[in-house]
């Protein structure tokens, strides 16, 4: 039967009359920076071109005493996972391999840099279609390696990397910590994080998504028809590189930001058991397992958003944390979160010509996170409207007053150490959805955007009694752009978006004290773009056919036949 | 994912007032920084990536590398330029004694220097 990992990334249902059959990644070139590979393996023969690039640390003559098959093992397996004839994700993709890891699977930051430079020069000399670079390696945090990845990404290359197998925060490793790189953690057949004793998949805010990475059957360098199972975040990254190749082949014009948003959007949500992650990392780690889109089109109408967490601010009184969106994304809202509940809110501010989300720690606080909601909104014109703290007991309010601008998010920031001691009524006047309302001692920031066909609405869910978590979700067809809490009292730890749900966290009921200040309302701002929907319908009207799943239906048969043919 | 994670080690070597004869002082108020891997066993001391400021041309990179070699030689140190970067980042890869870091950080156009370190198959 089809290997579990290929089944897992195949969408469960699809409508065959909806879309064009893609070509399995044939328009895309995938560069692999890894060990040497066995290019004559029948899984990858004719699909992988071994470049003359080699930059590896010395091995004390190991290649002499170590079997060549072992030297080729890691790279051969990954090439097979990406584009293998029988067990590969993107069977049509062509690959180029660069040797940056020696027979022990060890390389250097400098060798990897020179490899990335080689790819950039090749791209300039002979421009081809979309490029995906797979980096199935990790070292300690490296400013220079992250910078090189950023430059290559800004040159239009999609970089996919392993989160690392250190059962640790991926932000401590490179290239996993580079914001421009798509960083992939590993899950098993039960959709649980891969673990092996003291080691296991990395996690945290620097991971974009997870993918199958345990007991993955692929090409073995033992012989040209051999297969073997391997495990690790490299295998997970190879799956995502394959999915990216499929998506880019179907839509070659996709930008990195669009691709990342699609990968997130089409992932399986909330299937990973978060209890495996350290408690402080659970909220930061995306609960996403990669999957192929159910069709090549049909996604264009969607307003795509993702949540980006900042690094922790640290505990000092004036500490701040900043969350940023990618260059092609719009910051549509900004929220903050503190485990201790001691924070001074958040604000959207301009930095280097772009809006960023800044959260403020409070005296005695253990630190805060800033949480940015980053969206793809073509032709958007967004601005922040601020109202200073109000004198009136009704609280501070601000609205979007420009013609055609809609409210996408609300933030509030305060200078007083504890808002909880001041409890004014917080009311939202009826019929004024384009308004942010907050505490009278807080300044309120409204994110107001104008974009073709953009419409937004406010959804609230209030709970009168103290509750550790209050959620409100946007319905089908709408995308969560803003997430905030009312009122901004001290027992509210913060608010953040998880997929299409706004989550407001409050302090443990037992520590809250009186129930009178227990009432919490989660406020979601849900948006959609009629403009994108129209454009997509026009596009779909001119296409017909089947889609990505057909390749996988065929693949199931191929694998089955291969399995029986050889055994 | 952030560029400015503070979890790696950063050593800022401040410029001394007695400038080296051959070195041009960097632009006022900018101090080149030195970075190394926080995981000690993964460090590769003796090999350094010298990253130059963004708009530095290849010819300037080569000139800076030669200047470092000349200044090191005057102090009795052998250095070897292993690679000159251009296309992605301006800079060069140099094999040298860690004793020369302070000197290297004072070179014109230097943004930061990073000690080489290991990466591993995952």
């Amino acid at each position: 039967s089809i290997p579990w990992n290929l089944e897992r990334i195949t969408p469960p249902r699809y409508r065959a009359d909806e879309y064009q059959p893609p070509d399995g990644g044939s328009l895309v070139e995938v560069y692999l920076l890894d060990t040497s590979i066995q290019s004559d393996h029948r899984e990858i023969e004719g699909r992988v071109m071994v470049t003359d690039f080699e930059n590896v640390p010395e091995e004390d003559g190991t290649r002499f005493h170590r079997q060549a098959s072992k030297c080729d093992s890691h790279g051969t397996h990954l090439a097979g996972v990406v584009s293998g004839r029988d067990a590969g994700v993107a069977k049509g993709a062509s690959m180029r391999s660069l040797r940056v890891l020696n027979c022990q699977g060890k390389g250097t930051v400098s060798g990897t840099l020179i490899g990335l430079e080689f790819i950039r020069k090749s791209q300039l000399v002979q421009p081809v279609g979309p490029l995906v670079v797979l980096l199935p390696l990790a070292g300690g945090y490296s400013r220079v390696l992250n910078a090189a990845c950023q430059r290559l990404a800004r040159a239009g290359v999609v970089l996919v990397t392993a989160a690392g197998n250190f059962r640790d925060d991926a932000c401590l490793y490179s290239p996993a910590s580079a914001p421009e790189v798509i960083t992939v953690g590993a899950t098993n057949a039960q959709d649980q994080p891969v673990t092996l004793g003291t080691l296991g998949t990395n996690f945290g805010r620097c991971v974009d998504l997870f993918a199958p990475g345990e007991d993955i059957i692929g090409a073995s360098s033992d012989c040209s028809t051999c297969f073997v199972s391997q495990s690790g975040t490299s295998q997970a990254a190879a799956h995502v590189a394959g999915i990216a190749a499929m998506m880019l082949s179907a839509e070659p014009e996709l930008t990195l930001a669009e691709l990342r948003q699609r990968l997130i959007h089409f992932s399986a949500k909330d299937v990973i058991n978060e209890a495996w992650f350290p408690e402080d990392q659970r909220v930061l780690t995306p609960n996403l397992v990669a999957a192929l889109p159910p069709s090549t089109h049909g996604a264009g109408w969607q307003l795509f958003c993702r949540t980006v967490w900042s690094a922790h601010s640290g505990p000092t009184r004036m500490a701040t944390a900043v969350a940023r969106c990618a260059p092609d994304e719009e910051l549509l809202s900004c929220s903050s979160f503190s485990r201790s509940g001691k924070r001074r809110g958040e604000r959207m501010e301009a930095q280097g010509g772009k809006l960023v989300c800044r959260a403020h720690n409070a005296f005695g606080g253990e630190g805060v996170y800033a949480i940015a909601r980053c969206c793809l909104l073509p032709q958007a014109n967004c601005s922040v409207h601020t109202a200073p703290p109000a004198e009136a007991s009704m609280g501070t309010r601000v609205h979007c007053h420009q013609q055609g601008h809609v409210l996408t998010g609300c933030s509030s920031h305060w200078e007083v150490e504890d808002l909880g001691t001041h409890k004014p009524p917080v009311l939202r006047p009826r019929g004024q959805p384009n308004q942010c309302v907050g505490h009278r001692e807080a300044s309120i920031h409204a994110s107001c955007c104008h974009a073709p066909g953009l419409e937004c609405k406010v959804k609230e869910h209030g709970i009168p009694a103290p509750q550790e978590q209050v959620t409100v979700a946007c319905e089908e067809g709408w995308t969560l752009t803003g997430c905030s809490a009312l009122p901004g009292t001290s027992h509210v730890l913060g608010a953040y978006a998880v997929d299409n749900t706004c989550v407001v966290r409050s302090r443990d009921v037992s520590t809250t004290g009186s129930t009178s200040e227990g009432a919490v309302t989660a406020v979601a701002i849900c948006c959609r773009s009629r403009h994108l929907a129209q454009a997509s319908q026009e596009l779909q009207g001119s296409t017909s056919g089947s889609g990505l799943n057909d390749i996988f239906e065929a693949q199931k048969i191929e694998w089955h036949e291969h399995h029986h043919h050889h055994h | 994912q952030e560029d400015e994670d503070g979890d790696y080690e950063e050593l800022v070597l401040a410029l001394r007032s007695e400038e080296d004869g051959l070195a041009e002082a960097p632009e006022h108020g900018t101090t080149a920084t030195f970075h190394r891997c926080a995981k000690d066993p993964w460090r590769l001391p003796g090999t350094y990536v010298v990253v130059l400021k963004e708009e530095t041309h290849l010819s300037q990179s080569e000139r800076t590398a030669r200047r470092l070699q000349a200044q090191a030689a005057r102090r009795g140190y052998l250095t070897k330029i292993l690679h000159v970067f251009h296309g992605l980042l301006p800079g060069f890869l140099v094999k040298m004694s860690g004793d020369l870091l302070e000197l290297a950080l004072k070179l014109p156009h230097v943004d930061y220097i990073e000690e080489d370190s290991s990466v591993f198959a995952q």
């Epitope: 004390d60 190991t62 005493h65 170590r66 079997q67 072992k70 093992s73 890691h74 022990q104 699977g105 060890k106 197998n165 092996l196 080691l199 007991d215 059957i217 073995s220 033992d222 012989c223 028809t225 051999c226 297969f227 073997v228 199972s229 391997q230 495990s231 690790g232 975040t233 490299s234 399995h563 050889h566 055994h567 | 591993f120 198959a121 995952q122």
Partner: antibody
Amino acid sequence: QVQLVQSGAEVKKPGASVKVSCKASGYTFTGYTIHWVRQAPGQGLEWMGYINPSSTYTKFNQKFKDRVTMTRDTSISTAYMELSRLRSDDTAVYYCARERIYSNYWFFDVWGQGTTVTVSS
Amino acid sequence: DIVMTQSPSSLSASVGDRVTITCKASQNVYWEVVWYQQKPGKSPKLLIYSASNRYTGVPSRFSGSGSGTDFTLTISSLQPEDFATYFCQQYSSYPYTFGGGTKVEIK
């Protein structure tokens, strides 16, 4: 659960051959190499070689190259090790073991219970 | 072939003792060393992989260290169930080779 179950003890005369079986269950048999390791009474462990069950690829310790044969039957998820021209110093417990690869690290994570082969005239 | 020399070949210790077993390779095997525990009449059981990584279910009192040619297995506080024979094995080069074993006995 994942396990390897080996055939029972054998007593053989010098010059004869012995064929030990190793039945795998609880995992995809063709996904992992099966290695054979022996242990003479009161002695250490000695690696004999392995088979990649997804094909018929084998690799042997030179010491046994001329006398050992490794095969597999994927329909019953079983690997076999045959040692010919037995000598008295081949008396040992023979183990099969599954090799796992994680992040470029290699190790035997599952072992059979062992098969005692006694060579005596 | 790479020779793995294990020492001591046997040692006597008491419950609670700290025990250290060493393994020396005849040439550089990097970190490509595994440690197994074997009890009489039983199959070997994986303890440490890649020189220093504890395998799933192995108690934290077991730790491994070393790289290149010198490797160490340490049991920080010996427990009654730890009396057994311990083997190191290199996988850097074929043929795989094992150390001669260290028998840990009750004093």
